[in-house]
């Protein structure tokens, strides 16, 4: 007698009736109704049999409308996943500003998610629609391998990103010095290798280890996961452990941010010079720009005193334009590279990530070009004939001359992937000899020649005024940095939440299945499994769209704004005006 497949209901939509159909209550049966000794008080099913053999039905017993609905829904999600992750990859490739350590992790994540969008989602959809695996054993095993390796790599990348952000915030001095693209590559490589080693051999070769294939024809699942306890073990390793670690890391990042908010509140309440100095050199660990970390921790007290007035630290490759940089004006990718000082420093949220070949943190003074005067470099001797008026904008900063050599300076500002607009001004370093009367050794010859010269009362007043104004600016910038950190914490919480929401239902089912074998309908498994895939759709949104440079690059790519002039105009508009102005009429300060 010929058999008939009962799989005539939609695996995604159990309530739609067809032959061998179950009642709406069936799929939603409470698991708690399983009674002692495994017996089950089940609701009755709607009866309406048909003798159609749906095992050979390409629609798996679904109606054409069910198929259209499933195909459109899953197809749309797959398309969004593919486009989103391709945008991340292409943006990284075309925009040199995005080639930062943190974004290498995002690139790896996007690659994993792209594989899921291209292969996993579509093959699983055909499996759902046909209600059987029609591509054979090899294709099944290859699909499962790719699926599990990519999904696990995605989770591992999320973990790596969480660790990276955690250490960037809590150990900026030690961690950031080691944070290079090479190390990032090693971490990414490890994430993929571990994922591959964990899953691929077991999926592909288990049948040979045990000597037989127990996966029935028309079905596609991992043979070694037939034991619920093994399945639960893998769920612990692949989900429960990572989500616990990520939650702990996020909580610590949050606490660190909270701690700094309180510290800042304390700093703002006071205005003494000593506190301002402590503010510039906090002892507690924090992230680079907001903590003003020193390259050498054993810096002399006198040096600290000297630099304690007004400075910011920059991680920089070089102040000299390289041949490559000089040529960028003529290269086709020029407009992707906002390398002017202001633009480079403005370069959006992926900022904390900069990996520099020979990473050096140094203090740079900005050359003030005043008409009729030679440049003042590291000098406390200000021209007495001219008064400088400080504009109402942020004091202590100056915009770099437009036609100056391109400057590849990246700030070590807070965590990268947040939506906060970055600072566009370059800071001035004021060497205050007003209080100390002497200066410590520096490499600047200009400093040695001019710093010891006596100051007029007017100049001293001006310097004092600068010191007071810039102290408030440092507090302001510290506050801005904390805002960035809070935004980063929010981004991280969104990422964590997205991961938990999308992966928890499936893993709860895995947990339930350990204690109640075969208690969860196929429909729920399919939905739970698909929900895990949706994490790959959400990841580019969570990460890249919260990064200003990614966003603008996406817009450029999507709108095909390939005209260099347009982009140059956009970049120019982002820059701020010069802050220092020469005042012609002499007025007492």
């Amino acid at each position: 007698m010929t058999l008939h497949s009962n799989s005539t209901t939609s695996p995604l939509f159990p309530n739609i009736s067809s032959s061998w159909v179950h009642s709406p209550s069936e799929a939603g049966l409470p698991l708690g109704t399983v009674t002692q000794l495994g017996s089950y008080n089940i609701s009755q099913e709607t009866g309406n049999f048909s003798s159609n053999d749906t095992s050979s039905d390409p629609l798996g017993g679904h109606t054409i409308w069910q198929v259209v609905f499933i195909a459109f829904l899953t197809g749309f999600l797959a398309l969004v996943t593919i486009i989103g992750n391709i945008l991340v990859i292409v943006a990284f490739k075309v925009n040199k500003q995005l080639k930062t350590v943190n974004n290498y992790f995002l690139l790896s994540l996007a690659c994993a998610d792209l594989i899921i969008g291209v292969i996993s989602m579509n093959l699983f959809t055909t499996y759902i629609i046909m209600n059987r695996w029609a591509l054979g054993n090899l294709a099944c095993d290859l699909w499962l391998s790719i699926d599990y390796v990519a999904s696990n790599a995605s989770v591992m990348n999320l973990l790596v990103i969480s660790f990276d952000r955690y250490f960037s915030i809590t150990r900026p001095l030690t961690y950031r010095a080691k944070r290079t693209t090479k190390r990032a590559g090693v971490m990414i490589g490890l994430a993929w290798v571990i994922s591959f080693v964990l899953w691929a051999p077991a999926i592909l070769f288990w049948q040979y280890f045990v000597g037989k294939r127990t996966v029935p024809p028309g079905e596609c699942f991992i043979q070694f996961l037939s034991e619920p306890t093994i399945t639960f073990g893998t769920a612990i390793a692949a989900f429960y452990m990572p989500v616990t670690i990520m939650t702990i890391l996020y909580w610590r990042i949050y606490k660190e941010t909270e701690k700094r908010t309180k510290e800042l509140a304390g700093l703002q309440a006071s205005g003494t010079e000593a506190e301002a100095e402590n503010f510039v050199h906090p002892t507690g660990s924090s992230r680079s720009c907001s903590s003003y970390e020193l390259q050498q921790q054993g810096v002399k007290r006198s040096s600290r005193r000297k630099y304690g007035r007004c400075h910011f630290w920059f991680t920089t490759k070089s102040w000299k334009p390289s041949a490559e940089q000089m040529d960028q004006d003529h290269s086709s990718s020029d407009s992707w590279n906002n390398n002017d000082a202001a633009a480079s420093l403005e370069n959006s949220a992926s900022s904390d990530e900069e990996d520099i070949g020979s990473e050096t943190r140094a203090i740079y003074s900005i050359v003030l070009k005043l008409p009729g005067h030679s440049s003042i470099l590291n000098s406390t001797k200000l021209p007495s004939s001219d008064n400088l008026q400080v504009s109402n904008e942020d004091l202590g900063t100056v915009d770099v001359e437009r036609n100056a050599h391109k400057l590849q300076a990246q700030k070590s500002m807070g965590d990268g992937d947040n939506c906060q607009k970055d600072f566009t001004k370059l800071p001035i370093q004021l060497e205050s000899a007003v209080d100390t009367g002497k200066t410590s050794d520096t490499n600047s010859s200009a400093d040695k020649t001019t710093a010891t010269l006596p100051l007029s009362f007017k100049e001293a007043t001006l310097a004092k005024r600068f010191a007071l104004k810039t102290r408030s600016q440092i507090t302001k910038r510290k506050r801005m940095s904390l805002i960035k950190e809070k935004k980063a914490a929010q981004t991280l919480s969104a990422i964590l939440l997205a991961f938990i929401i999308t992966w928890t239902p499936y893993n709860i089912m895995v947990l339930v299945n350990t204690f109640c074998d075969s208690c969860i309908p196929k429909t729920y498994w399919n939905l739970g499994y698909w929900l895990c895939y949706i994490n790959s759709t959400v990841n580019p949104v969570c990460y890249a769209l919260c990064n200003k440079t990614f966003r603008t690059t996406f817009k450029t790519l999507l709108l095909c704004q390939c005209d260099k002039r347009k982009r140059r105009k956009q970049q120019y508009q982002q820059r701020q005006s010069v802050i220092f102005h020469k005042r012609v009429p002499e007025q007492a300060l």
Epitope: T9, F221, D517, K522
Partner: nanobody, 124 residues
Framework: QVQLQESGGGLVQAGGSLRLSCTAS????????MGWFRQAPGKEREFVAA???????YHQDSVKGRFTISRDNAKNTVYLQMNYLKPEDTAVYYC??????????????????RGQGTQVTVSS
């Protein structure tokens, strides 16, 4: 071709016993979880009993202690031993095979194959 053939049905007095058999051909029974469902005339189809790959067995509350599901993989056969039969047990009994491990024993739509059924009539 895959086939599931039920046998052992018939007319029996209330309180009597029957043993239903379901012989599979075209598939390896050990790779499948098996289940029994029944449908009385004018009534909804209902789950009776099922086993799983891991040796667990499940029975509906109304048949618990009276019906037992078992299998013999060597013979590619699944059994439903029915004792202390009641008139309300009268129905067509179907056996079904479930290939996916991500499925529910009680959900008829989760079963890949089913037989044509065998009639069981319990007279009072």
């Amino acid at each position: 071709q895959v086939q599931l053939q039920e046998s052992g049905g018939g007319l029996v007095q209330a309180g009597g016993s029957l043993r239903l058999s379901c012989t599979a051909s075209g598939l390896t029974l050990s790779n499948y979880a098996m289940g029994w469902f029944r449908q009385a005339p004018g009534k909804e189809r209902e789950f009776v009993a099922a086993d799983t790959w891991n040796g667990n067995t499940y029975h509906q509350d109304s048949v618990k202690g009276r019906f037992t599901i078992s299998r013999d993989n060597a013979k590619n056969t699944v059994y439903l031993q029915m004792n202390y039969l009641k008139p309300e047990d009268t129905a067509v009994y179907y056996c079904a095979a479930r290939g996916s491990r991500r499925s529910a024993y009680y959900s008829s739509s989760d079963y890949t194959y089913r037989g044509q059924g065998t009639q069981v009539t319990v007279s009072s």
